[in-house]
């Protein structure tokens, strides 16, 4: 038997993926566990194998269909169970009735690219991935820029309160290496959270022209 406190958290990416993390103090490392999804009104069900992400937590992704297919709606309730093998039987370790559109976390923005760079400014664009058509253009973004000698945690957050898939960074230092990240969040859902940060985009501002004021 496995004792200790257990936490089972899942998010829906708004299209065809439910990602889950299960943590259990005192859990057995060599136990085989999985997440099972059973919707209340759909003909499919789905399973994924929990894989370790740290000493006492496991994660997996329930792939519900093609990446851009709309597999769930606001009225769906999905019973999610953590099942662990005990000998020849499966034991239910955790269970929740999951409301997908109350627990949203979109995929991280992708395809970050520098559109135009100058000495003091840089225009960057990105794309969102696998976001439901239900949101239309009603999404918000947060962005941050890593300056030399600083950490990501120290970087001020820039908020974009609309679906604007570009930003113009200003007051940059010439001939300097920077990194940029962005994340996205829908407006809907009581327990909705920010997407993971995008992969960082590295860029360098242009050097100041010699003999000119900058």
């Amino acid at each position: 038997a496995v004792n200790g406190t257990s936490q089972f958290t899942c998010f829906y990416n708004s299209r065809a993926n439910i990602s889950c993390v299960w943590s259990q103090d005192g859990a057995l490392q060599d136990t085989s566990c999985q997440v099972h999804a059973w919707p209340d009104r759909r003909r499919w069900n789905q399973t994924c194998e929990l894989l370790p992400v740290s000493q006492a937590s496991w994660a997996c992704n329930l792939i519900l269909g093609a990446p851009d297919s709309q597999k769930l709606t606001t009225v769906d309730i999905v019973t999610l169970r953590v099942l662990c093998r005990e000998g020849v039987r499966w034991r239910v370790m955790a269970i929740q009735d999951f409301k997908p559109f109350e627990n949203l976390r979109l995929m991280a923005p992708i395809s970050l690219q520098v559109v135009h760079v100058e000495t003091h400014r840089c225009n960057i664009s990105w794309e969102i991935s696998q976001a439901s058509h239900y949101f239309e253009r009603h999404l918000e973004f947060e962005a941050r820029t890593l300056s030399p000698g600083h950490t990501w945690e120290e970087a001020p957050l820039l908020t974009l309160k609309q679906k604007q898939e570009w930003i113009c960074l200003e007051t940059l230092t010439p001939d300097t290496q920077y990194e940029f990240q962005v994340r996205v969040k829908p407006l809907q859902g009581e327990f909705t959270t920010w997407s993971p940060w995008s992969q960082p985009l590295a860029f360098r501002t242009k050097p100041a022209a010699l003999g000119k004021d900058t």
């Epitope: 009104r41 003909r43 597999k71 239900y134 239309e136 829908p186």
Partner: nanobody, 119 residues
Framework: QLQLVESGGGLVQTGGSLRLSCAVS????????MGWYRQVPGKQRELVAD???????KYADSVKGRFSILRDSVKNTVYLQMSSLKPEDTGIYYC?????????????WGQGTQVTVSS
């Protein structure tokens, strides 16, 4: 102004049929579910049938095999085909639509249409 307009209610004999319809019109929206609920005096409003995106229909046990729901997502209209009607099907039938407006989801209700099944 957003509106849900119901029609098709009326008085019918036991064993007869009726077809209810409900159309949503008005401001910009996307519907992800539409359905029918009924209310009888002194009781809570209860689900009769609904249909969500992806074609998943849900029916109350008491109407399975007798009622059929059809949703036209292009016209934003939902129909309820009721056959083999019984006196216990009598009540006010309300249309409900789950609508996405400006990135948020809300439920909207029609005014209701009376269905009376006489024995």
């Amino acid at each position: 102004q957003l509106q849900l307009v119901e029609s098709g209610g009326g008085l019918v004999q036991t064993g007869g049929s009726l077809r209810l319809s409900c159309a949503v019109s008005g401001s910009r929206f996307i519907s992800d579910v539409m359905g029918w609920y009924r209310q009888v005096p002194g009781k809570q409003r209860e689900l009769v049938a609904d249909m969500a995106d992806g074609g998943s229909a849900k029916y109350a046990d008491s109407v399975k095999g007798r009622f059929s729901i059809l949703r036209d997502s292009v016209k934003n209209t939902v129909y309820l085909q009721m056959s083999s009607l019984k006196p216990e099907d009598t009540g006010i039938y309300y249309c409900k639509a789950g609508l996405w407006i400006a990135g948020r989801h809300s439920d909207y209700w029609g005014q209701g249409t009376q269905v009376t099944v006489s024995s």
